[in-house]
Interface confidence: low
Protein backbone atom coordinates (compact mmCIF):
# COMPACT_ATOMS: atom_id res chain seq x y z
CA UNK A 1 0.00 0.00 0.00
CA UNK A 2 1.46 3.37 -1.02
CA UNK A 3 1.01 6.24 1.43
CA UNK A 4 -0.96 9.31 0.34
CA UNK A 5 1.45 12.26 0.08
CA UNK A 6 1.09 15.63 -1.65
CA UNK A 7 2.68 15.98 -5.08
CA UNK A 8 5.81 18.20 -4.98
CA UNK A 9 5.49 21.49 -6.79
CA UNK A 10 5.99 21.28 -10.56
CA UNK A 11 5.88 17.50 -10.63
CA UNK A 12 2.22 17.00 -11.49
CA UNK A 13 2.11 14.76 -14.61
CA UNK A 14 0.47 16.44 -17.60
CA UNK A 15 0.87 13.31 -19.72
CA UNK A 16 2.26 9.79 -19.47
CA UNK A 17 5.82 10.09 -20.77
CA UNK A 18 9.43 8.99 -20.18
CA UNK A 19 10.05 11.62 -17.49
CA UNK A 20 7.96 9.45 -15.12
CA UNK A 21 10.62 6.73 -14.94
CA UNK A 22 12.63 9.05 -12.65
CA UNK A 23 9.71 9.40 -10.22
CA UNK A 24 9.88 7.54 -6.94
CA UNK A 25 6.97 5.27 -6.11
CA UNK A 26 5.36 7.80 -3.78
CA UNK A 27 5.74 10.52 -6.43
CA UNK A 28 3.96 8.42 -9.02
CA UNK A 29 1.17 7.80 -6.54
CA UNK A 30 0.86 11.48 -5.72
CA UNK A 31 1.50 13.08 -9.11
CA UNK A 32 -0.14 10.85 -11.72
CA UNK A 33 -3.87 11.24 -12.09
CA UNK A 34 -5.61 7.87 -12.47
CA UNK A 35 -7.99 9.16 -15.14
CA UNK A 36 -5.02 10.48 -17.17
CA UNK A 37 -3.35 7.09 -16.83
CA UNK A 38 -6.52 5.33 -18.02
CA UNK A 39 -6.79 7.48 -21.14
CA UNK A 40 -3.08 7.14 -22.00
CA UNK A 41 -2.57 3.45 -21.13
CA UNK A 42 -1.21 2.78 -24.63
CA UNK A 43 1.87 4.86 -23.76
CA UNK A 44 2.83 2.85 -20.68
CA UNK A 45 4.36 -0.03 -22.65
CA UNK A 46 6.74 2.26 -24.49
CA UNK A 47 8.21 3.46 -21.17
CA UNK A 48 10.72 1.25 -19.28
CA UNK A 49 9.02 1.36 -15.88
CA UNK A 50 10.35 -0.89 -13.12
CA UNK A 51 8.11 -3.62 -11.72
CA UNK A 52 7.74 -1.54 -8.54
CA UNK A 53 6.55 1.44 -10.57
CA UNK A 54 4.10 -0.75 -12.47
CA UNK A 55 2.71 -1.86 -9.08
CA UNK A 56 1.90 1.78 -8.32
CA UNK A 57 0.21 2.29 -11.71
CA UNK A 58 -1.86 -0.84 -11.17
CA UNK A 59 -2.86 0.42 -7.72
CA UNK A 60 -4.08 3.68 -9.25
CA UNK A 61 -6.21 1.85 -11.82
CA UNK A 62 -7.61 -0.43 -9.11
CA UNK A 63 -8.74 2.63 -7.14
CA UNK A 64 -10.31 4.21 -10.20
CA UNK A 65 -12.10 1.01 -11.27
CA UNK A 66 -12.88 -1.04 -8.13
CA UNK A 67 -15.53 -3.04 -10.04
CA UNK A 68 -13.08 -4.02 -12.80
CA UNK A 69 -11.39 -2.19 -15.68
CA UNK A 70 -13.30 -1.17 -18.80
CA UNK A 71 -12.27 -2.85 -22.04
CA UNK A 72 -10.76 0.39 -23.38
CA UNK A 73 -8.16 0.15 -20.60
CA UNK A 74 -7.77 -3.64 -20.71
CA UNK A 75 -6.89 -3.59 -24.41
CA UNK A 76 -3.86 -1.36 -23.73
CA UNK A 77 -2.60 -2.96 -20.50
CA UNK A 78 0.40 -4.53 -22.20
CA UNK A 79 3.00 -5.61 -19.64
CA UNK A 80 0.79 -4.39 -16.82
CA UNK A 81 -1.32 -7.48 -17.58
CA UNK A 82 1.45 -9.58 -16.01
CA UNK A 83 0.73 -7.79 -12.73
CA UNK A 84 -2.92 -8.77 -12.69
CA UNK A 85 -4.19 -11.57 -10.48
CA UNK A 86 -6.87 -14.07 -11.57
CA UNK A 87 -9.14 -12.30 -9.04
CA UNK A 88 -8.62 -8.99 -10.87
CA UNK A 89 -9.35 -10.59 -14.23
CA UNK A 90 -12.56 -12.23 -13.02
CA UNK A 91 -14.02 -8.72 -12.71
CA UNK A 92 -13.43 -7.95 -16.38
CA UNK A 93 -15.82 -8.19 -19.27
CA UNK A 94 -13.69 -8.88 -22.36
CA UNK A 95 -15.65 -9.16 -25.59
CA UNK A 96 -13.22 -8.06 -28.31
CA UNK A 97 -10.98 -10.60 -29.98
CA UNK A 98 -8.45 -7.79 -30.50
CA UNK A 99 -8.24 -7.28 -26.74
CA UNK A 100 -7.72 -11.00 -26.22
CA UNK A 101 -4.95 -11.10 -28.86
CA UNK A 102 -3.21 -8.05 -27.37
CA UNK A 103 -3.04 -9.66 -23.92
CA UNK A 104 -2.03 -13.11 -25.21
CA UNK A 105 0.79 -11.41 -27.11
CA UNK A 106 2.17 -10.10 -23.80
CA UNK A 107 2.35 -13.65 -22.42
CA UNK A 108 3.65 -15.18 -25.67
CA UNK A 109 6.30 -17.86 -25.30
CA UNK A 110 5.37 -18.61 -21.69
CA UNK A 111 3.27 -21.54 -20.45
CA UNK A 112 -0.35 -20.71 -19.93
CA UNK A 113 -0.48 -18.83 -16.63
CA UNK A 114 -3.46 -18.80 -14.24
CA UNK A 115 -4.04 -15.20 -15.41
CA UNK A 116 -4.25 -16.24 -19.06
CA UNK A 117 -6.45 -19.24 -18.23
CA UNK A 118 -8.83 -16.91 -16.35
CA UNK A 119 -8.81 -14.36 -19.20
CA UNK A 120 -9.65 -17.05 -21.76
CA UNK A 121 -12.36 -18.46 -19.51
CA UNK A 122 -13.95 -14.99 -19.14
CA UNK A 123 -13.76 -14.39 -22.88
CA UNK A 124 -15.22 -17.75 -23.92
CA UNK A 125 -17.98 -17.57 -21.32
CA UNK A 126 -18.83 -14.08 -22.56
CA UNK A 127 -19.17 -15.38 -26.12
CA UNK A 128 -21.15 -18.45 -25.11
CA UNK A 129 -19.17 -20.83 -27.31
CA UNK A 130 -15.75 -21.41 -28.82
CA UNK A 131 -16.28 -19.92 -32.28
CA UNK A 132 -13.81 -20.45 -35.10
CA UNK A 133 -12.01 -17.09 -34.79
CA UNK A 134 -11.50 -17.56 -31.06
CA UNK A 135 -10.25 -21.11 -31.50
CA UNK A 136 -7.93 -19.96 -34.28
CA UNK A 137 -6.46 -17.35 -31.99
CA UNK A 138 -6.14 -19.56 -28.92
CA UNK A 139 -4.54 -22.51 -30.69
CA UNK A 140 -2.11 -20.15 -32.46
CA UNK A 141 -0.83 -18.97 -29.06
CA UNK A 142 -1.32 -22.27 -27.20
CA UNK A 143 -1.30 -25.36 -29.41
CA UNK A 144 -2.31 -27.47 -26.40
CA UNK A 145 -5.28 -25.25 -25.53
CA UNK A 146 -7.98 -27.50 -26.92
CA UNK A 147 -6.70 -30.46 -24.92
CA UNK A 148 -6.73 -28.46 -21.70
CA UNK A 149 -10.53 -28.23 -21.86
CA UNK A 150 -12.79 -30.74 -20.17
CA UNK A 151 -15.08 -32.88 -22.35
CA UNK A 152 -17.97 -30.74 -21.08
CA UNK A 153 -16.26 -27.53 -22.22
CA UNK A 154 -15.40 -29.11 -25.57
CA UNK A 155 -19.06 -29.82 -26.16
CA UNK A 156 -19.53 -26.06 -26.73
CA UNK A 157 -17.20 -26.15 -29.74
CA UNK A 158 -19.33 -25.86 -32.90
CA UNK A 159 -18.41 -28.25 -35.76
CA UNK A 160 -17.55 -25.26 -37.96
CA UNK A 161 -14.68 -24.41 -35.57
CA UNK A 162 -13.04 -27.78 -36.21
CA UNK A 163 -11.63 -26.42 -39.47
CA UNK A 164 -9.30 -24.27 -37.36
CA UNK A 165 -7.77 -27.28 -35.60
CA UNK A 166 -4.32 -28.47 -36.66
CA UNK A 167 -2.97 -31.98 -35.91
CA UNK A 168 -0.52 -30.63 -33.31
CA UNK A 169 -3.41 -29.00 -31.43
CA UNK A 170 -4.65 -32.51 -30.57
CA UNK A 171 -1.32 -34.02 -29.52
CA UNK A 172 -2.13 -33.99 -25.81
CA UNK A 173 -5.87 -34.75 -26.04
CA UNK A 174 -6.96 -37.86 -24.20
CA UNK A 175 -9.54 -40.37 -25.50
CA UNK A 176 -12.47 -38.82 -23.62
CA UNK A 177 -11.76 -35.47 -25.25
CA UNK A 178 -11.45 -37.06 -28.69
CA UNK A 179 -14.77 -38.84 -28.07
CA UNK A 180 -16.34 -35.37 -28.01
CA UNK A 181 -14.33 -33.88 -30.87
CA UNK A 182 -14.53 -36.78 -33.33
CA UNK A 183 -18.29 -36.55 -34.11
CA UNK A 184 -17.87 -32.80 -34.65
CA UNK A 185 -14.97 -33.40 -37.04
CA UNK A 186 -16.93 -36.06 -38.90
CA UNK A 187 -19.75 -33.57 -39.39
CA UNK A 188 -17.38 -30.75 -40.38
CA UNK A 189 -15.56 -32.80 -43.03
CA UNK A 190 -18.49 -34.90 -44.30
CA UNK A 191 -18.56 -33.34 -47.76
CA UNK A 192 -14.90 -34.01 -48.57
CA UNK A 193 -13.83 -36.84 -50.86
CA UNK A 194 -12.15 -40.00 -49.53
CA UNK A 195 -8.45 -39.17 -49.46
CA UNK A 196 -8.92 -35.53 -48.44
CA UNK A 197 -11.38 -36.60 -45.75
CA UNK A 198 -8.88 -39.06 -44.28
CA UNK A 199 -6.13 -36.42 -44.10
CA UNK A 200 -8.44 -34.11 -42.11
CA UNK A 201 -10.10 -36.72 -39.87
CA UNK A 202 -6.89 -38.64 -39.07
CA UNK A 203 -5.95 -36.56 -36.00
CA UNK A 204 -9.42 -37.09 -34.47
CA UNK A 205 -9.61 -40.87 -34.95
CA UNK A 206 -8.82 -41.56 -31.29
CA UNK A 207 -12.53 -40.95 -30.80
CA UNK A 208 -13.78 -43.09 -33.71
CA UNK A 209 -16.12 -46.07 -33.11
CA UNK A 210 -15.61 -49.51 -34.67
CA UNK A 211 -18.10 -49.00 -37.49
CA UNK A 212 -16.24 -45.92 -38.73
CA UNK A 213 -12.92 -47.80 -38.69
CA UNK A 214 -14.55 -50.61 -40.67
CA UNK A 215 -15.79 -48.06 -43.21
CA UNK A 216 -12.31 -46.53 -43.51
CA UNK A 217 -10.80 -49.96 -44.10
CA UNK A 218 -12.78 -50.11 -47.35
CA UNK A 219 -11.23 -46.88 -48.65
CA UNK A 220 -7.51 -47.68 -49.16
CA UNK A 221 -6.46 -45.10 -46.58
CA UNK A 222 -3.10 -46.67 -45.52
CA UNK A 223 -3.30 -45.54 -41.91
CA UNK A 224 0.13 -45.18 -40.27
CA UNK A 225 1.00 -47.06 -37.08
CA UNK A 226 1.21 -43.89 -34.96
CA UNK A 227 -2.45 -43.18 -35.75
CA UNK A 228 -3.46 -46.82 -35.25
CA UNK A 229 -1.81 -46.88 -31.81
CA UNK A 230 -3.97 -43.94 -30.69
CA UNK A 231 -7.27 -45.63 -31.62
CA UNK A 232 -9.61 -46.67 -28.83
CA UNK A 233 -8.93 -50.24 -27.75
CA UNK A 234 -12.64 -51.02 -27.60
CA UNK A 235 -13.02 -49.76 -31.19
CA UNK A 236 -10.10 -51.85 -32.51
CA UNK A 237 -10.93 -55.16 -30.82
CA UNK A 238 -13.89 -56.12 -33.07
CA UNK A 239 -11.92 -55.51 -36.30
CA UNK A 240 -11.03 -58.63 -38.28
CA UNK A 241 -7.50 -59.38 -39.48
CA UNK A 242 -8.60 -58.59 -43.03
CA UNK A 243 -10.02 -55.22 -41.96
CA UNK A 244 -6.87 -54.24 -40.09
CA UNK A 245 -4.78 -55.31 -43.08
CA UNK A 246 -6.87 -53.09 -45.37
CA UNK A 247 -6.86 -50.23 -42.90
CA UNK A 248 -3.07 -50.19 -42.54
CA UNK A 249 -2.17 -51.15 -46.10
CA UNK A 250 1.64 -51.24 -46.45
CA UNK A 251 2.00 -50.19 -42.79
CA UNK A 252 0.63 -53.54 -41.58
CA UNK A 253 4.19 -54.79 -41.07
CA UNK A 254 4.52 -52.31 -38.21
CA UNK A 255 2.18 -54.45 -36.10
CA UNK A 256 5.10 -56.73 -35.25
CA UNK A 257 7.02 -53.94 -33.51
CA UNK A 258 3.93 -52.99 -31.51
CA UNK A 259 2.67 -56.49 -30.65
CA UNK A 260 3.21 -56.01 -26.90
CA UNK A 261 1.52 -52.62 -26.74
CA UNK A 262 -2.12 -51.59 -26.52
CA UNK A 263 -4.28 -51.71 -28.62
CA UNK A 264 -2.31 -54.17 -30.81
CA UNK A 265 -1.63 -56.57 -27.93
CA UNK A 266 -5.30 -56.86 -26.98
CA UNK A 267 -6.42 -57.08 -30.61
CA UNK A 268 -3.98 -59.96 -31.33
CA UNK A 269 -5.35 -61.93 -28.39
CA UNK A 270 -8.87 -61.68 -29.85
CA UNK A 271 -7.89 -63.14 -33.25
CA UNK A 272 -7.76 -66.74 -34.45
CA UNK A 273 -4.17 -67.86 -34.98
CA UNK A 274 -4.99 -69.02 -38.53
CA UNK A 275 -6.12 -65.50 -39.41
CA UNK A 276 -3.02 -63.91 -37.87
CA UNK A 277 -0.81 -66.29 -39.82
CA UNK A 278 -2.18 -64.91 -43.09
CA UNK A 279 -0.29 -61.67 -42.33
CA UNK A 280 3.03 -63.53 -42.35
CA UNK A 281 4.37 -61.41 -39.48
CA UNK A 282 4.80 -64.14 -36.86
CA UNK A 283 2.17 -62.65 -34.55
CA UNK A 284 1.19 -65.04 -31.76
CA UNK A 285 -2.36 -64.93 -30.37
Amino acid sequence: EVEKTACPSGKKAREIDESLIFYKKWELEACVDAALLATQMDRVNAIPFTYEQLDVLKHKLDELYPQGYPESVIQHLGYLFLKMSPEDIRKWNVTSLETLKALLEVNKGHEMSPQVATLIDRFVKGRGQLDKDTLDTLTAFYPGYLCSLSPEELSSVPPSSIWAVRPQDLDTCDPRQLDVLYPKARLAFQNMNGSEYFVKIQSFLGGAPTEDLKALSQQNVSMDLATFMKLRTDAVLPLTVAEVQKLLGPHVEGLKAEERHRPVRDWILRQRQDDLDTLGLGLQG
Partner: nanobody, 128 residues
Framework: QVQLVESGGGSVQAGGSLRLSCTAS??????????MGWFRQAPGKEREAVAA????????YYADSVKGRFTISQDNAKNTVYLQMNSLKPEDTAMYYC???????????????????WGQGTQVTVSS
Protein backbone atom coordinates in the same frame (compact mmCIF):
# COMPACT_ATOMS: atom_id res chain seq x y z
CA GLN B 1 -13.84 -42.93 -8.20
CA VAL B 2 -10.23 -43.32 -9.35
CA GLN B 3 -7.64 -42.81 -6.61
CA LEU B 4 -3.87 -42.42 -6.63
CA VAL B 5 -2.28 -43.35 -3.30
CA GLU B 6 1.29 -42.28 -2.53
CA SER B 7 3.67 -43.54 0.13
CA GLY B 8 7.37 -43.47 0.97
CA GLY B 9 7.94 -39.83 1.84
CA GLY B 10 9.85 -38.75 4.91
CA SER B 11 12.90 -36.95 6.25
CA VAL B 12 16.45 -37.80 5.24
CA GLN B 13 19.95 -36.31 5.38
CA ALA B 14 21.52 -34.85 2.23
CA GLY B 15 23.07 -37.64 0.17
CA GLY B 16 20.51 -40.14 1.42
CA SER B 17 17.81 -42.06 -0.48
CA LEU B 18 14.03 -42.49 -0.46
CA ARG B 19 11.66 -44.56 -2.56
CA LEU B 20 8.22 -43.20 -3.32
CA SER B 21 5.44 -45.39 -4.63
CA CYS B 22 2.10 -44.50 -6.21
CA THR B 23 -0.67 -47.03 -6.71
CA ALA B 24 -3.72 -46.39 -8.89
CA SER B 25 -7.01 -47.93 -7.83
CA UNK B 26 -7.43 -49.30 -11.37
CA UNK B 27 -5.55 -49.64 -14.65
CA UNK B 28 -5.78 -46.09 -15.98
CA UNK B 29 -4.24 -46.97 -19.35
CA UNK B 30 -7.57 -48.62 -20.22
CA UNK B 31 -8.98 -45.08 -20.35
CA UNK B 32 -6.00 -43.81 -22.29
CA UNK B 33 -4.21 -42.19 -19.33
CA UNK B 34 -0.91 -43.73 -20.31
CA UNK B 35 1.54 -41.53 -18.40
CA MET B 36 2.14 -41.76 -14.66
CA GLY B 37 4.70 -39.86 -12.72
CA TRP B 38 5.57 -37.28 -10.15
CA PHE B 39 5.32 -33.53 -9.74
CA ARG B 40 6.71 -31.65 -6.77
CA GLN B 41 5.96 -28.32 -5.15
CA ALA B 42 8.23 -26.52 -2.73
CA PRO B 43 6.75 -23.75 -0.51
CA GLY B 44 6.21 -20.58 -2.51
CA LYS B 45 7.18 -22.22 -5.80
CA GLU B 46 5.30 -23.51 -8.84
CA ARG B 47 4.47 -27.18 -9.15
CA GLU B 48 7.05 -28.81 -11.45
CA ALA B 49 7.30 -32.16 -13.20
CA VAL B 50 9.99 -34.47 -11.80
CA ALA B 51 9.75 -37.77 -13.65
CA ALA B 52 7.24 -39.77 -15.65
CA UNK B 53 6.86 -43.15 -17.30
CA UNK B 54 4.79 -44.13 -20.34
CA UNK B 55 3.02 -47.09 -18.76
CA UNK B 56 3.23 -50.32 -20.72
CA UNK B 57 6.17 -49.11 -22.81
CA UNK B 58 8.54 -48.02 -20.09
CA UNK B 59 9.67 -44.87 -21.91
CA UNK B 60 10.76 -42.34 -19.27
CA TYR B 61 11.06 -38.59 -18.78
CA TYR B 62 13.16 -36.77 -16.17
CA ALA B 63 13.50 -33.10 -15.28
CA ASP B 64 17.07 -31.89 -15.82
CA SER B 65 17.48 -31.24 -12.09
CA VAL B 66 17.01 -34.93 -11.17
CA LYS B 67 18.64 -36.74 -14.12
CA GLY B 68 21.14 -39.33 -12.95
CA ARG B 69 19.84 -39.25 -9.36
CA PHE B 70 16.18 -40.29 -9.65
CA THR B 71 14.84 -43.41 -11.37
CA ILE B 72 11.20 -44.06 -12.22
CA SER B 73 9.92 -47.61 -12.74
CA GLN B 74 6.61 -49.44 -12.89
CA ASP B 75 4.89 -52.63 -11.86
CA ASN B 76 2.05 -52.99 -14.35
CA ALA B 77 0.46 -55.90 -12.52
CA LYS B 78 0.02 -53.72 -9.43
CA ASN B 79 -0.80 -50.46 -11.26
CA THR B 80 2.10 -48.98 -9.34
CA VAL B 81 4.86 -46.53 -10.23
CA TYR B 82 8.01 -46.08 -8.13
CA LEU B 83 10.39 -43.16 -7.82
CA GLN B 84 13.80 -44.12 -6.46
CA MET B 85 15.50 -40.94 -5.24
CA ASN B 86 19.24 -41.14 -4.58
CA SER B 87 21.85 -38.50 -3.68
CA LEU B 88 19.10 -36.31 -2.31
CA LYS B 89 19.80 -32.58 -1.91
CA PRO B 90 18.14 -29.95 0.33
CA GLU B 91 16.62 -28.39 -2.83
CA ASP B 92 14.69 -31.64 -3.38
CA THR B 93 12.60 -30.77 -0.32
CA ALA B 94 8.98 -30.48 -1.44
CA MET B 95 5.57 -32.08 -1.44
CA TYR B 96 5.64 -34.82 -4.10
CA TYR B 97 2.42 -35.53 -5.99
CA CYS B 98 1.65 -38.57 -8.08
CA UNK B 99 -0.16 -37.77 -11.32
CA UNK B 100 -1.79 -39.58 -14.23
CA UNK B 101 -2.53 -38.15 -17.68
CA UNK B 102 -2.59 -38.87 -21.38
CA UNK B 103 0.71 -38.26 -23.20
CA UNK B 104 1.25 -38.31 -26.95
CA UNK B 105 4.93 -38.65 -26.02
CA UNK B 106 6.21 -38.99 -22.47
CA UNK B 107 7.85 -35.54 -22.57
CA UNK B 108 4.30 -34.08 -22.66
CA UNK B 109 4.06 -34.96 -18.97
CA UNK B 110 5.37 -31.55 -17.89
CA UNK B 111 2.11 -29.64 -18.45
CA UNK B 112 0.29 -29.95 -15.13
CA UNK B 113 -2.92 -28.39 -16.56
CA UNK B 114 -3.56 -31.59 -18.49
CA UNK B 115 -3.27 -33.96 -15.52
CA UNK B 116 -6.48 -35.96 -15.07
CA UNK B 117 -5.83 -37.53 -11.65
CA TRP B 118 -3.73 -36.29 -8.71
CA GLY B 119 -2.65 -38.03 -5.53
CA GLN B 120 -2.89 -36.30 -2.14
CA GLY B 121 0.88 -35.78 -1.95
CA THR B 122 3.69 -37.06 0.26
CA GLN B 123 6.25 -34.80 1.96
CA VAL B 124 9.97 -35.22 1.31
CA THR B 125 12.35 -33.25 3.54
CA VAL B 126 16.11 -33.26 2.96
CA SER B 127 18.26 -31.60 5.62
CA SER B 128 21.89 -30.61 5.25
Amino acid sequence: QVQLVESGGGSVQAGGSLRLSCTASEDLSIYGYNCMGWFRQAPGKEREAVAAIYTGRGTTYYADSVKGRFTISQDNAKNTVYLQMNSLKPEDTAMYYCASKYCAVVADFGNSRLVRYWGQGTQVTVSS
